[in-house]
Interface confidence: medium
C-alpha cells in the first residue's frame, strides 16, 4: 500500500523520498517565504482503516513572506542567492530530538550520511536558474532545518534518520 502524491501547499514544495505507508516527509517553503511559527511542515503516509486507502496527513504549514527579503534588490544573474533565514524550531524526528552533532570521521557520522536515498530527485518545476542558487537556508540553533528553498526545485527526500550502522541499499561509504 502506498500513498498518492501529497497535496500541494501554497508557496511550498515537498521532497518525497518514499510513498510507502508511515513514511514521514516534510514540505519546504519556497524562496522568499518562511514557515509561520506554530505551523508544521510534516506529513505522514497513513492508512484509513475504514477504507483501506493510504493518504497523507494534512500539514498545518503556512508559508509567509519573509520580511527580511522584501527590500532586497535582485542579485546579478551570476550570483542569484537568497538571504538565509532562521525559522522557529521544528522537530523532524519522531522523538522530537535531533541527532547530536558528531565528528565527520566518526562511524556515526558516516552512518547518518547514509540517510541519503538512491533515486531521490530534485524535480524542477521550471528550468534551473543560472548562477548560485540557494536551495534552503541554515538550520536554527535548535538543530532543525530552515523551511526555505529555491522556487524552482521540488525536494524529494525525507527527514528520517538512520541508526548507526544502517546503510540503505544503493550507497557505499568509504571512511
Amino acid at each position: 500500500i502506498t500513498c498518492p502524491p501529497p497535496m500541494s501547499v501554497e508557496h511550498a514544495d515537498i521532497w518525497v523520498k518514499s510513498y510507502s505507508l508511515y513514511s514521514r516527509e516534510r514540505y519546504i517553503c519556497n524562496s522568499g517565504f518562511k514557515r509561520k511559527a506554530g505551523t508544521s511542515s510534516l506529513t505522514e503516509c497513513v492508512l484509513n482503516k475504514a477504507t483501506n486507502v493510504a493518504h497523507w496527513t494534512t500539514p498545518s504549514l503556512k508559508c509567509i513572506r519573509d520580511p527580511a527579503l522584501v527590500h532586497q534588490r535582485p542579485a546579478p544573474p551570476s550570483t542569484v542567492t537568497t538571504a538565509g533565514v532562521t525559522p522557529q524550531p521544528e522537530s523532524l524526528s519522531p522523538s522530537g530530538k535531533e541527532p547530536a552533532a558528531s565528528s565527520p570521521s566518526s562511524n556515526n557520522t558516516a552512518a547518518t550520511t547514509a540517510a541519503i536515498v538512491p533515486g531521490s530527485q530534485l524535480m524542477p518545476s521550471k528550468s534551473p536558474s543560472t548562477g548560485t542558487t540557494e536551495i534552503s537556508s541554515h538550520e536554527s540553533s535548535h538543530g532543525t532545518p530552515s523551511q526555505t528553498t529555491a522556487k524552482n526545485w521540488e525536494l524529494t527526500a525525507s527527514a528520517s534518520h538512520q541508526p548507526p550502522g544502517v546503510y540503505p541499499q544503493g550507497h557505499s561509504d568509504t571512511t
Epitope: T81, G84, P99, A101, S102, S103, P104, S105, T109, A110, A111, T112, T113, A115, I116, V117, S120, T132, T133, E134, I135, S136, S137, H138, E139, P145, S146, A157, S158, A159, S160, H161, D173, T174, T175
Partner: nanobody
Framework: EVQLVESGGGSVQPGGSLTLSCAAS????????MNWVRQAPGKGLEWVSR????????IYTDSVKGRFTISRNNAKNALYLQMNSLKPEDTAVYYC????????????????RGQGTQVTVSS
C-alpha cells in the same frame, strides 16, 4: 555571498574520463560537507556523491560507485569529481552543492548549488 562555480565539463566518448571542479567562495568551505548532483535531460536532479568537511568520508549513489571519486582541497576551497569509465547515462548537467549542516552528516539537504557544467557522453 555564497558562490559555487563548476568547470571541467565537456563531451567524451563512452569509457572516457573527465574531472569536474567546483570553486567555492563566500562561506567557510572547510566546515561544510559538499555534494555533487546531476540533472539528465528531461529528468529530475539526482544526488551523486557527498564528501565530509574534512574529506575523510565519502558516499556515492550506486550507479557511479567504483567509477566516480569525490575529493576536495580545503586550502583551495575546491571540490572535485573524477569521473572514469563514463557511460551515456552519465550525460547530465553536474552541479556542486553545499550541504546545509555544519560538520555533520544528516539526510542530504543542501542549501546552495552552482550553475552547473554539462557532461555529454556519446559515441
Amino acid at each position: 555571498e555564497v558562490q559555487l562555480v563548476e568547470s571541467g565539463g565537456g563531451s567524451v566518448q563512452p569509457g572516457g574520463s573527465l574531472t569536474l571542479s567546483c570553486a567555492a567562495s563566500g562561506f567557510a568551505f572547510s566546515l561544510y560537507h559538499m555534494n555533487w548532483v546531476r540533472q539528465a535531460p528531461g529528468k529530475g536532479l539526482e544526488w551523486v556523491s557527498r564528501i565530509s568537511n574534512d574529506g575523510t568520508s565519502t558516499i556515492y549513489t550506486d550507479s557511479v560507485k567504483g567509477r566516480f571519486t569525490i575529493s576536495r582541497n580545503n586550502a583551495k576551497n575546491a571540490l572535485y569529481l573524477q569521473m572514469n569509465s563514463l557511460k551515456p547515462e552519465d550525460t547530465a548537467v553536474y552541479y556542486c552543492a553545499k550541504s546545509t549542516y555544519d560538520s555533520r552528516w544528516r539526510d542530504h539537504d543542501y542549501d546552495y548549488r552552482g550553475q552547473g557544467t554539462q557532461v555529454t557522453v556519446s559515441s
